[in-house]
Amino acid sequence: MMTGTIETTGNISAKKGGSVILQCHLSSTMAQVTQVNWEQHDHSLLAIRNAELGWHIYPAFKDRVAPGPGLGLTLQSLTMNDTGEYFCTYHTYPDGTYRGRIFLEVLESSVAEHSARFQIP
């Protein structure tokens, strides 16, 4: 069992075309975080936040991924294909690696929801 714990936003849902914030938080440890990796369900890297080098967004996601807030990640222009698991990996010393999981479900905007937004009371 590791010293610290990872808290995540857990299971979240967002609408197609919208955006969502993925957040992880490492607590209960004095270890220093040197890097946070954000991975998609197929284990492809979305982005890296390195303590020395800052943010790096991988080219395939540059148009739809924004760094932050904090060590989190914002996914934009969501599609149904974005549904699935996302992982934050905290590389720390001397504790080693902490891993958090978030499940994102992207929902179709239903006709009812769409029309309700424009409903006149």
């Epitope: 069992m1 590791m2 010293t3 004095m30 220093q32 040197t34 890097q35 990796n37 390195n50 303590a51 020395e52 080098l53 990996t89 590389h91 010393y93 001397p94 504790d95 080693g96 690696t97």
Partner: antibody
Framework: QLQLQESGPGLVKPAETLSLTCTVS??????????WTWIRQPPGKGLEWIGT???????FHNPSLKSRVTIPVDTSKNQFSLKLSSVTAADTAVYYC??????????????WGQGTLVTVSS | DIQMTQSPSSLSASVGDRVTITCRAS??????LNWYQQKPGKAPKLLIY???SLQSGVPSRFSGSGSGTDFTLTISSLQPEDFATYYC?????????FGGGTKVEIK
């Protein structure tokens, strides 16, 4: 098979800077999962942790060595180094470089170089 | 800093003996305790990590136990190649610290 090899002068004059390099082969120093370390052992004595570095340059060092230690990284050469300033005879030791791994909680030092003896003397 | 105290500092034993080395931490380090073997003129070699996990390639006669502050390295049946110095090391927090070593000599 991962290998680490220390290199540098075996004799350093007092008050000068000790400089050693560790060359890593059989693996990448830029691995996100590993940290890289310097450890020393004075003749006939025990082991002392000097400091640890991540590929990007984040460093952790032993407060007992105050601010005398820097651990630069050169990812293009797959190397990391040790620079210890203002040396005295007490810094005479065998210096080892090592990898922090495997990818487990609070990892140990799993691969070591063979060590290089550095003597501080005028 | 966490102090690591090993005992005994040296011991004499015969081939086939069961050997026990202890390591005590000055505060709780959970199970983040590692054991190394060092032979003269050679680099230390990792034997046990996380108190009881055997490093790949290390003979099963080596075992580790303990948690908190008290840890033990046991060699169930000492072999000629086991005569060496053994060090414990905590990886719980920085600065990383080692025990003073236990030299296992031939009786």
């Amino acid at each position: 098979q991962l290998q680490l090899q220390e290199s540098g002068p075996g004799l350093v004059k007092p008050a000068e800077t000790l400089s050693l390099t560790c060359t890593v082969s059989g693996g990448s120093i830029s691995s996100y999962d590993h940290y890289w370390t310097w450890i020393r052992q004075p003749p006939g004595k025990g082991l002392e942790w000097i400091g640890t570095v991540y590929y990007s340059g984040s460093t952790f060092h032993n407060p007992s060595l105050k601010s005398r230690v820097t651990i630069p990284v050169d990812t293009s050469k797959n190397q990391f180094s040790l620079k210890l300033s203002s040396v005295t005879a007490a810094d005479t030791a065998v210096y080892y470089c090592a990898r922090v791994g495997p990818d487990v909680s609070h990892p140990p030092f799993d691969y070591w170089g063979q060590g290089t003896l550095v003597t501080v003397s005028s | 800093d966490i102090q690591m105290t090993q005992s005994p500092s040296s011991l004499s034993a015969s081939v086939g003996d069961r050997v026990t080395i202890t390591c005590r931490a000055s505060q709780s380090i959970s199970s983040y305790l590692n054991w190394y073997q060092q032979k003269p003129g050679k680099a230390p070699k990792l034997l046990i990590y996380a108190a009881s996990s055997l490093q790949s390639g290390v003979p099963s006669r080596f075992s580790g136990s303990g948690s908190g502050t008290d840890f033990t390295l046991t060699i169930s049946s000492l072999q000629p190649e086991d005569f060496a110095t053994y060090y414990c090391q905590q990886s719980y927090s920085t600065p990383i610290t080692f025990g003073g070593g236990t030299k296992v000599e031939i009786k």
